[in-house]
Interface confidence: medium
């Protein structure tokens, strides 16, 4: 099954203390999938999409950007034929960066 798309959604964080919002969308006809957000190889958050939606938005509280390091990826799982679990590949990476202070 194809990899999901991933993107940062507004409002974008301006510092490490700001929350981060990341949308993850399954392509095609995979509503109600279970989505996983990863960072640094480990799971950050799990969300299930509503049965009529193909994606979710992960809302990470302020400070989530500090550890573990590395870009975010997401992935989704669905029940396929004969009730067998299937997993997508990882999304492309998305990096969270912060504006350089002007002072």
């Amino acid at each position: 099954i194809p990899a999901p798309s991933i993107r940062l959604v507004p409002p974008y964080p301006s510092s490490q203390e700001d929350p981060i919002h990341i949308a993850c969308m399954a392509p095609g006809n995979f509503p109600g999938a279970n989505f996983t957000l990863y960072r640094g190889g480990q799971v950050v958050q799990l969300l299930q999409a509503p049965t009529d939606q193909r994606g979710v938005t992960f809302n990470l509280s302020g400070g989530s950007s500090k550890a573990p390091g590395g870009p975010f990826h997401c992935q989704y799982g669905v029940l396929g034929e004969l009730n067998q679990s299937q997993l997508s590949d990882l999304s492309e990476p998305v990096n969270v960066s912060f504006p350089v202070p002007t002072w």
């Epitope: 990863y38 190889g41 799971v43 590395g70 799982g77 299937q86 997993l87 590949d89 990882l90």
Partner: antibody, heavy 117, light 115 residues
């Protein structure tokens, strides 16, 4: 330091069952997917399946689906592999491996399973 | 035809470079896959080396020297593990792996000999 220690291997007759365990330490077990991989003597590795962090989502290789059951107990930091209807071709070293995203980075030392009458 | 094909063996001299290939079956486009590489020495489990999809989507294993690197050859539909400055301790079996059809698939492995 991440450590994975498999146990439960041995010699078993064809058609019988066996349960392997993998004790994990040195990382937050519940935050990582876990895998079982086997390697027959003189052959390359063969992936058997993945169980996600909360245990609700398990994906198996086609070659073993229906005969193998992967489970985990996050309170005990332990991964399990239940193998039923064992065949001669199941003879291999069985490794558990720690998830890295949905792949795997660290492997245990393995436990040998020999299926023989 | 196997999903991933690796040459059974390869020999190279100390200090030289070795290029290990992992060819994807026809109809499977290497450009869309992350290729993972593992090293295995006799009597030990495989060790994770690196993952490579593109220069913007790659990851080196913890403690893996930078002389191990990944790339792709789109014309050959292959992933490549490049080992530069070969050392005697690099003598091992090397396996590639991809996530394909909701399963991890390994190549048959390449036995690298450092002469």
């Amino acid at each position: 330091e991440v450590q994975l220690v498999e146990s439960g291997g041995g010699v078993v007759q064809p058609g019988r069952s066996l349960r392997l365990s993998c004790a994990a330490s040195g990382f937050t077990f519940s935050s990582f997917a876990m895998h079982w991989v086997r390697q027959a003597p003189g052959k390359g590795p063969e992936w058997l399946g993945i169980i996600l962090y909360e245990g609700g989502h398990v994906v198996y290789a086609d070659s073993v689906r229906g005969r193998l059951t992967i489970s985990r107990d996050n309170s005990k930091n332990t991964l399990y592999l239940q193998m039923d209807s064992l065949r001669d071709e199941d003879t291999a070293v069985y490794y558990c491996a720690k998830g890295f995203y949905h792949a795997f980075d660290v492997w245990g030392q393995g436990t040998m399973v020999t299926v023989s009458s | 035809q196997a999903v991933l094909t690796q040459p059974a063996s390869l020999s190279a001299s100390p200090g030289a470079s070795a290029s290990l290939t992992c060819t994807l079956r026809s109809g499977i486009n290497v450009g869309t896959y992350r290729i993972y590489w593992y090293q295995q020495k006799p009597g030990s489990p495989p060790q994770y080396l690196l993952r490579y999809k593109s220069d913007s989507d790659k990851q080196q294993g913890s403690g893996v020297p930078s002389r191990f690197s990944g790339s792709k050859d789109a014309s050959a539909n292959a992933g490549i593990l490049l080992i530069s400055g070969l050392q005697s301790e690099d003598e091992a079996d090397y396996y590639c792996m991809i996530w394909h059809s909701s399963a991890w698939v390994f190549g048959g492995g390449t036995q690298l000999t450092v002469l």
